[in-house]
């Protein structure tokens, strides 16, 4: 559910990506959200996406569990009281495992129609 | 002060299912999940599955995945948590909860008062 | 799933010991990882939360401790009525897990 009493998410960046785990960084006004709530799902899988959720004054937080060499998409939304904004998303393949960190390979965001890639 | 009130106790035959219900009062539902809880007699806790009403989509630990349902009235406040093909193992005390952390940062835990489901021939 | 391991599963104390019991996570879990007490009879009370937040209304004499995959309990001095089962529980990844718990009997 979304509402136009809801501001907005402002941006979602991938700032480090490892062979298991990234650290997601994202934008959002200052105390508007309960909490934040974050869906990992693995591209072109049946499987059911893993769900976390962070505290609304949070901007950042690690995910961890993921799998290497791997094509996932984040998509976070803020929550508050019965409201949920629109979800922004994220397209982003994990490291092979050869190096702890790489630069993100891929990085996507996108809310409504409009499309950011940033290589 | 939020309080959970959940349904009387049941007894079931093996291979049926049962529902049991949890009514949320004194608080926001939508946007807390409520988790599931068991307790088999002596044993430990286990963790069933979670729901966030707003999001309606439940998360359900691997050993129940297919067997049970847990689903969300936004409109009476009220989660429900279905187990299916049940067997004597399955008796034990059933809680629903709204626990800090997944989608809850509040001061609090709460817990309704569990639900015993005898299964039983 | 994430498996949560802890130990002693019982273990049999006298009143002013020092108590600590392990959880272990099987990969690392994002701290939201709380600690819980239960009585027979009676829904879990929660004593920590956040690895080392105390509860309010709960005794200093439980804290908490550890980072990543490995996560203590520590009682600093066992009184009469912390006689009980203890858990742990991460909720920070779903689906949430509990460890199987540790009894602490009287000696």
């Known amino acids: 559910a979304s509402t136009g009493e809801t501001p907005n998410l402002g941006e979602v960046v991938v700032a480090e990506v490892g062979w298991d785990a990234l650290k997601l960084n994202w934008t959002a006004p200052e105390g508007a959200y309960e909490y934040f709530f974050i869906q990992v799902q693995e591209a072109d899988t049946v499987e059911a996406a893993q769900n976390l959720t962070v505290p609304g004054g949070l901007r950042s937080t690690d995910l961890p569990g993921l799998k290497a060499a791997t094509h996932y998409t984040i998509t976070i939304r803020g929550v508050t009281q019965d409201f949920s904004t629109t979800p922004l998303s994220v397209e982003v393949l994990t490291a092979s495992g050869l190096n702890d960190i790489f630069e993100a390979q891929k990085i996507e965001w996108h809310e409504g129609t409009h499309h950011h890639h940033h290589h | 002060q939020v309080q959970l009130v959940q349904s009387g106790a049941e007894v079931k035959k093996p291979g049926s299912s049962v529902k049991v219900s949890c009514k949320a009062s004194g608080g926001t539902f939508s946007s807390y999940a409520i988790s599931w809880v068991r307790q088999a007699p002596g044993q430990g806790l286990e963790w069933m599955g979670g729901?966030?009403?707003?999001?309606?989509?439940?998360n359900y630990a691997q050993k129940f995945q297919g067997r049970v349902t847990i689903t969300a009235d936004k409109s009476t406040s009220t989660a429900y948590m279905e187990l299916s093909s049940l067997r004597s193992e399955d008796t034990a005390v059933y809680y629903c909860?709204?626990?800090?952390?997944?989608?809850?940062?509040?001061?609090?835990?709460?817990w309704g008062q569990g639900t015993t489901v005898t299964v039983s021939s | 799933d994430i498996q949560m391991t802890q130990s002693p599963s019982s273990l049999s104390a006298s009143v002013g010991d020092r108590v600590t019991i392990t959880c272990r996570a099987s990969q690392s879990i994002r701290n939201v990882l709380g600690w819980y007490q239960q009585k027979p009879g009676k829904a879990p009370k929660r004593l920590i939360y956040?690895?080392?937040s105390l509860q309010s209304g709960v005794p200093s004499r439980f804290s908490g401790g550890g980072s990543g995959t490995e996560f203590t309990l520590t009682i600093s001095s066992l009184q009469p009525e912390d006689f009980a089962t203890y858990y742990c529980l991460q909720n920070g990844l779903q689906p949430a897990t509990f460890g199987q718990g540790t009894k602490v009997e009287i000696k």
């Open positions: 956040d690895v080392s």
């Open positions: 729901i966030i009403p707003i999001f309606g989509t439940a």
């Open positions: 909860a709204r626990l800090y952390g997944y989608a809850y940062y509040g001061a609090f835990d709460y």
